[in-house]
Each structure stands twice: as structure tokens, then as C-alpha cells.
């Protein structure tokens, strides 16, 4: 049995994945729980097993199809339910009518690479992964650079207000190790949020030429 309040939050990656987290304040006995997705007009439904991520929250990924297939669109509404087994039957613990394109969180950008590096600047490119064709160019990015002696949280955010999959970092220190991350967000969707940060890309600026003033 369950007491207390629960929170059920899901995001669509814009292609073929809905990721959900269910949090439950009250005590939940050892039981099997799952998320069930039932689209309003599609000839499929999907479930995933909720697995614990902390003492009071569980997560799962609804895999709707091949990673780059467009399984849902702006016209869809998906009924999402948390179901937990109670004896021989399933009990509905949480339910929401989920509009995929109002609740977007894309996959983290991938394939980060240094295009060109100099003493004071570095040009970096990346790619977006599993992003819907519906966005066309309506995406924005945030980037951050980790400097020696600082934390990621201290790194200033650079905002790219358009679909630009590269950046030229300026005013870097010669012969210095840096790390770089980027994340992406569609402009569409009332509850849309930033993707996770990309894997960090490590790079080193070139040393200053000997005898040259830096």
C-alpha cells in the first residue's frame, strides 16, 4: 500500500523514447511497478519496468521503436499510467495525459570534436542525436568550458539562440587543458527542458611561440 504524495514526470526525446521518473513519498512495499503508455490514435502500446534510482523514486524508458523512427507527433496524446502489482491485480498509482511535443527533452549532443585549435581559440563542432525533423531549425544550445582550477558549476554559460552545431571559443590561455560540454533544447513545448550535458570533450590549446609576446 502507498501513502503520501507521488510525482510522475515524463519527457519525450522527440523520436522513439519516453523517459519517466515516479517519486513516491510514502512507504512502498517491495512490489513490481511499471509505466504503461497508451497513445490516443496509434495501433501500439508500450510498457517499461520501473527500477529504483533512489529510496523513493523509480525510473524507466519506454522504447517505442527504432531510435530514429518518428513514433509520435504534435497531434498525439499518450495516456501514461504507473501500475503497481497488488496481489493478483495491478493498481493505478499515477496517471497523466501526456502531450509529447509539450514535454521534450532531447538526447545529449554527440560526436564532439575539435575542428581547429590555436593558442587562444578553439573551434568545436557537435551533432544532435535522435532529434525530430519537426524542429527544422528551431533549436537552441548552451555550452560551457571548464578551465583549470574551476568547477563545471562555475563555468559561464554560452547561449546559441539558433541551430548552430559549432562554436569558436575565444580568449583561451595558451598551452592549457580545457574541457567543453554542450546541451540542446527545442523552442517548442510548454514543459520542454534542456537535454543532459554532452560527454565532456577535452582539448589543449597550442603553446605560445617562443620569443613571441602573448
Amino acid at each position: 500500500a502507498v501513502n503520501g504524495t507521488s510525482q510522475f514526470t515524463c519527457f519525450y526525446n522527440s523520436r522513439a523514447n519516453i523517459s519517466c521518473v515516479w517519486s513516491q513519498d510514502g512507504a512502498l512495499q517491495d512490489t513490481s511497478c511499471q509505466v504503461h503508455a497508451w497513445p490516443d490514435r496509434r495501433r501500439w502500446n508500450q510498457t517499461c519496468e520501473l527500477l529504483p534510482v533512489s529510496q523513493a523514486s523509480w525510473a524507466c524508458n519506454l522504447i517505442l521503436g527504432a531510435p530514429d523512427s518518428q513514433k509520435l507527433t504534435t497531434v498525439d496524446i499518450v495516456t501514461l499510467r504507473v501500475l503497481c502489482r497488488e496481489g493478483v491485480r495491478w493498481r493505478v498509482m499515477a496517471i497523466q495525459d501526456f502531450k509529447p511535443f509539450e514535454n521534450l527533452r532531447l538526447m545529449a549532443p554527440i560526436s564532439l570534436q575539435v575542428v581547429h585549435v590555436e593558442t587562444h581559440r578553439c573551434n568545436i563542432s557537435w551533432e544532435i542525436s535522435q532529434a525530430s525533423h519537426y524542429f527544422e531549425r528551431h533549436l537552441e544550445f548552451e555550452a560551457r568550458t571548464l578551465s583549470p582550477g574551476h568547477t563545471w558549476e562555475e563555468a559561464p554559460l554560452l547561449t546559441l539562440k539558433q541551430k548552430q552545431e559549432w562554436i569558436c571559443l575565444e580568449t583561451l590561455t595558451p598551452d592549457t587543458q580545457y574541457e567543453f560540454q554542450v546541451r540542446v533544447k527545442p523552442l517548442q513545448g510548454e514543459f520542454t527542458t534542456w537535454s543532459p550535458w554532452s560527454q565532456p570533450l577535452a582539448f589543449r590549446t597550442k603553446p605560445a611561440a617562443l620569443g613571441k609576446d602573448t
Epitope: R41, R43, Q70, T73, V75, H133, Y134
Partner: antibody, heavy 116, light 107 residues
Amino acid sequence: QVQLVQSGAEVKKPGASVKVSCKASGYTFSRYWIEWVRQAPGQGLEWMGEILPGSGSINHNEKFQGRVTFTADTSTSTVYMELSSLRSEDTAVYYCTRHYGSFDYWGQGTTVTVSS
Amino acid sequence: DIQMTQSPSSLSASVGDRVTITCKASQNVGTDVAWFQQKPGKAPKSLIYSASYRYNGVPSRFSGSGSGTDFTLTISSLQPEDFATYYCHQYSSYPFTFGQGTKLEIK
């Protein structure tokens, strides 16, 4: 088995309104969108809009916005399409169809003739 | 609005022929395309959804393919009852739209 049965043919004068019914059976009525599609004589198919009976949610083709009204009566599993301010170019066969996968089951059609 | 352009607009063929009808969307619609068959004085009949999935009861000679903007309906071996008008349809975004139709006639 799934069936959509529509009301009979109508003859209307320009400026009048027409209300076409679509009675569903053989499935959970509240759960599936009902679409309305029309076909003028010798012409192709044109989507007018849709209603989800369980929630009353509605989406229109903007071309008909303000002239078309969709309603649903869950007690009788019937959907209604009312088109107002009729003109001669509204003469057409009007179909209801269920949306599951795409438009899978269709009503037999209702002929609406607008003539003075 | 997304335009669905079918070709050809009419086609003459014989029983046993293999026939292909194409449909081009003005924007990417993923695989949210359906195909319908309509005979004179009758309601459309659903054949294919999600570009390539046949509805129950639809003969296997009907097949659909494509994604993005280019789609095809193929009838592998025409039967006498297949002579009709065929429509493609996108339900990817509002307003839902149809192709102008392809009339398949007996040669």
C-alpha cells in the same frame, strides 16, 4: 464488429445549417477520435476536423473554423457534425471515420445538397 | 498545410499487372501516411497505415512503402475488384490532408 452509421441525406437552402449524426458501435466509443471528412461531387477528400468523445477535445480544419461544430453524446455513442451558413459549395458527401492507426472504419456517408 | 501530390492522376492497366502509385508530401511526414481505396458511390476503404502496415483483411497484394516525403502504394497483381480510385493521406500534422486521387481503370 466496429460500425459507424450515419444519418440520412439532407437538402438545405443557402444560409441554413445541417446536423449530421454518426452512431458508433462495436468498440469503446469514448476512447477513439472521430474524424469528419467530406467529398464534393467528382472531387477528392477534405478533412474537416475531429472530436475525442471521452474528453470532448476538438481540432478543426481552420477552413471551417467558426462554421463547424462537433459534439458527442456518450450515452448514445453518437457524434454530431453541424455546419452552418451553408453555401452551394458545401454540397458534398460527409463521412465520419474512426482514427486508429489512421482512418480505419468509415460511415456510409451522408449526402448534403445545398440548393435554393 | 502539407500538400500531398499523387501521380499519376489516372492509370490504365490490365488484370495481373503490377501497379505503383506514388505520393509526395510537401514536408517530411515521417511514416504517418495512409492509403485508401474508393469505388463510385461508396465510402473509402482503408488499406495501409503508417506507410507500410496493412489493415486486417486487406489482401497481401497491396503493399506500401516510404518515409519522409516519398511514398508508394504497390498492387503486385491487379484483380478485377481493384479498379477504383486510390488516395494517400497524411496524419502527421494538422490539418490532415489527402492526395488528389489516382483513378485506376481497366485497359
